[in-house]
Structure formats: structure tokens, C-alpha cells
């Protein structure tokens, strides 16, 4: 998490014009995880590497966007590039490239995440939702999701909307939300941890 957009950008920018064209065509037919839509063909084919990077991140978020990019690169026979991309973005899949901060480990952890355990209390008691959104924006929340949460009229409905996106999150994404909660309402987290 955190640098997937950078890793995707480097991978796509290091494709030749012909390879980028091939990448886009493969992206139109690559199998997608359930619940994810496809980038419209018309928009996709006209994009440069930078636009495509941002579109991948906004459509699929950073973690899945990087995984999908690596899958397509592998399918194109670019195993080394796919491997480098995954090394830079996937938790526990080897060291990050020299000089790059390795992402936090996200091995399977026993039981429910704090965020899921205390869902009802967080919906009822979080007041600083805007702060959370800013902390999560571009990392685990797409622009659309960010706007959708902000559009809700009350804090509980904002939190309810935010929780509607968490089923697609991995443990690391939930850790980011927990970290943001610790920074904005530490007393609430401490209270819930004691309960």
C-alpha cells in the first residue's frame, strides 16, 4: 500500500508504445474480481501511461490495481516487469526495490479486525469523518467513494457509507483506517480497545 501508484506508473512508462497498446487491449479482456467494473474501451485506448495509471488506481484502488497490472504484464510475457511491480507493492512477496520503503506486512491475522469488531460503535461515535476521508483518499478510497461518503448528511450515515466499501479491503487497508482513527480520535480507540 502507499506506493502502488508509483510502481504502476513506472511499469507502464517503461512499456514501449507498441507494448502499451497491447497492454490496453489485454486489459479489455482480462478476468476481473467480482464487484469490479471494466474501464470503458473508448477512454482506455486514448490514454497515455500517466492517465492509465490514475484510471487503474481510481477504478481498482492501489492494491488490486497493481495486482491486475502485474497479471496483464505477465500475460504479455513481461515476467521481470511483473515481478518488480509485485515486489514493490505486494505484502510479503519479497523485498521492495532498493531505496523503497517496504509496505507493511499483511499476512492473514486471526479473528476480526478492530474495524470490523467495533463497526457499530464507530458508526455511532466517530465525529471527525472528514479527517478520516482525507487520510484514506487516494490510498484506499477512490474519488467516487470519497465524494459519496462526503455527500452523506450526518456523521453516522457518512460512517455507514464508508463501511459499505470495507468488504473489498484487505487487512492493511483496515490498518490505515485504524491508524487514522488513532490520530484523530485516540480516546475513542483506547476506549474501544478496553471494552
Amino acid at each position: 500500500m502507499g506506493r502502488a501508484r508509483d510502481a504502476i506508473l513506472d511499469a507502464l512508462e517503461n512499456l514501449t508504445a507498441e507494448e502499451l497498446k497491447k497492454f490496453k487491449l489485454k486489459l479489455l479482456s482480462v478476468p476481473l474480481r467480482e464487484g469490479y467494473g471494466r474501464i470503458p474501451r473508448g477512454a482506455l485506448l486514448s490514454m497515455d501511461a500517466l492517465d492509465l495509471t490514475d484510471k487503474l488506481v481510481s477504478f481498482y484502488l492501489e492494491t488490486y490495481g497493481a495486482e491486475l497490472t502485474a497479471n496483464v504484464l505477465r500475460d504479455m510475457g513481461l515476467q521481470e516487469m511483473a515481478g518488480q511491480l509485485q515486489a514493490a507493492t505486494h505484502q510479503g512477496s519479497g523485498a521492495a526495490p532498493a531505496g523503497i520503503q517496504a509496505p507493511p506486512q499483511s499476512a492473514a491475522k486471526p479473528g476480526l479486525h478492530f474495524i470490523d469488531q467495533h463497526r457499530a460503535a464507530l458508526i455511532a461515535r466517530v465525529t471527525n469523518v472528514e479527517w478520516l476521508l482525507d487520510a484514506l483518499y487516494g490510498k484506499v478510497l477512490t474519488d467516487e467513494q470519497y465524494q459519496a461518503v462526503r455527500a452523506e448528511p450526518t456523521n453516522p450515515s457518512k460512517m455507514r457509507k464508508l463501511f459499505s466499501f470495507t468488504p473489498a479491503w484487505n487487512w492493511t487497508c483496515k490498518d490505515l483506517l485504524l491508524q487514522a482513527l488513532r490520530e484523530s480520535q485516540s480516546y475513542l480507540v483506547e476506549d474501544l480497545e478496553r471494552s
Epitope: R5, D6, I8, L9, A49, P97, A98, A135, G138
Partner: antibody, heavy 117, light 107 residues
Framework: QVQLQQSGAELARPGASVKLSCKAS????????ISWVKQRTGQGLEWIGQ????????YYNEKFKDKATLTADKSSSTVYMELRSLTSEDSAVYFC??????????WGQGTTLTVSS | DIQMNQSPSSLSASLGDTITINCHAS??????LSWYQQKPGNIPKVLIY???NLQTGVPTRFSGSGSGTGFTLTISRLQPEDIATYYC?????????FGGGTKLEIK
């Protein structure tokens, strides 16, 4: 460890051209972009352009489009920047920097260019 | 091109203080903003990437926040080694562009 070794200081005449080099080591050369950044004495940082090493894709700041040309030699893991039609305005320190996506994590030591008649 | 406006251009503070430097982008850059520190006579060094992520090895006294068009670098418990010029840089669109810099001095 990651290193970007830049060529030594240059003294050039107005109207001439110079070619600065930046040799990379300690990382997979073709996985990144290398940028060049200009800094005049006592001034801020100005991004000149960037070259992606595997594809040779280049991007330039419009201001430097007619001034600078970026090239890469994969066999020697070296990036070059040629500056042409030199004037006193081109006297500056030029840095090469490895970009990981949209931010740079390693910089060369800088090359001082002095343009003087 | 995206313009990056940094303020203040210079700043004088006492050891132990907390200071903030602001950076405003001329258009939405999401969270694609980095902060650099350049000490006198030295090369620039990245402190923060993606608006709020601390680069490996950078002290936790440094923190970044913001998204969209407004960003802030905060340095808490100011130390003598923090004397430097600080630059923001956007990474949303080519050409990458830097702010004009903020020169930090100790009172």
C-alpha cells in the same frame, strides 16, 4: 547501494553545447525514470525533464524543450542530457535524480555548468 | 502546467518550536505531492511522498497532510539540523513542478 554518479564540472562558451552524464548503479536500471533538475545559485529547483529507461519515453518541461535532449545508454546504465545554444542563463548546478513514480528518492551529487566567454 | 505556490518563502523559528509550511496547487493533484529538504550546499532529500507518507529514515518529527489543492508540511520539536530550504513537488501531471521553496532559519 543505489548511486547516481554525475560527470564533473563544465566550463563552456556561449553558443556551445555540452553533454552531462549520470551513471546509475545499485538498482535495476530499466525499472525507473531518471529526471534532470536545474538549480541556479541561490534559486529553487526546476524540473527539466525525465526519461524512462526501458522504453526511452521522454517528457520535458516546455521551458526546456528547445534547450535539453535526454538520452539513455542501457548497456552502460548511463543517462545523458545535452544542453545546446548555451547562454549565461544556463549556468547552474544540474542534478540527475531517480524517480520512483512521481517522487524522487535518490539524487546525483550535481554537475556545475559555467557558461562564460 | 500545474503551478505550486509555497508559503511562507522564509521562516524564522526557535529550537523546539512546531512550524508549518504550506503548498497550494493550481489544480487538484489528489495526494500526489512530495516534500524535499535541501540543506545548504547539499543535494535535495525526499521527506514525504504521497502527501503524508514518511520516507524511510526520516524522523517522525516531520509530517505531511492535505489532498486536492492544499498541503502542509509540519516539523515539530525543531532541531538545529532542520535548517534548510524545503520544497514541495507535484506528481499528478507532467511536467513535475516544484514550489518556490521555504527557507527555514533558527532564531
Amino acid at each position: 547501494q543505489v548511486q547516481l554518479q554525475q560527470s564533473g564540472a563544465e566550463l563552456a562558451r556561449p553558443g556551445a553545447s555540452v553533454k552531462l552524464s549520470c551513471k546509475a548503479s545499485g538498482f535495476s536500471f530499466t525499472s525507473y525514470g531518471i529526471s534532470w533538475v536545474k538549480q541556479r545559485t541561490g534559486q529553487g529547483l526546476e524540473w527539466i525533464g525525465q526519461i524512462y529507461l526501458r522504453s526511452s519515453n521522454t517528457y520535458y518541461n516546455e521551458k526546456f524543450k528547445d534547450k535539453a535532449t535526454l538520452t539513455a545508454d542501457k548497456s552502460s546504465s548511463t543517462v545523458y542530457m545535452e544542453l545546446r545554444s548555451l547562454t549565461s542563463e544556463d549556468s547552474a548546478v544540474y542534478f540527475c535524480a531517480r524517480y520512483y513514480g512521481s517522487s524522487s528518492d535518490y539524487w546525483g551529487q550535481g554537475t556545475t555548468l559555467t557558461v562564460s566567454s | 502546467d500545474i503551478q505550486m505556490n509555497q508559503s511562507p518563502s522564509s521562516l524564522s523559528a526557535s529550537l523546539g518550536d512546531t512550524i508549518t509550511i504550506n503548498c497550494h496547487a493550481s489544480q487538484n493533484i489528489n495526494v500526489w505531492l512530495s516534500w524535499y529538504q535541501q540543506k545548504p550546499g547539499n543535494i535535495p532529500k525526499v521527506l514525504i511522498y504521497q502527501a503524508s507518507n514518511l520516507q524511510t529514515g526520516v524522523p517522525t518529527r516531520f509530517s505531511g497532510s492535505g489532498s486536492g489543492t492544499g498541503f502542509t508540511l509540519t516539523i515539530s520539536r525543531l532541531q538545529p539540523e532542520d535548517i534548510a530550504t524545503y520544497y514541495c513537488q507535484q506528481g499528478q501531471r507532467y511536467p513535475w513542478t516544484f514550489g518556490g521553496g521555504t527557507k527555514l532559519e533558527i532564531k
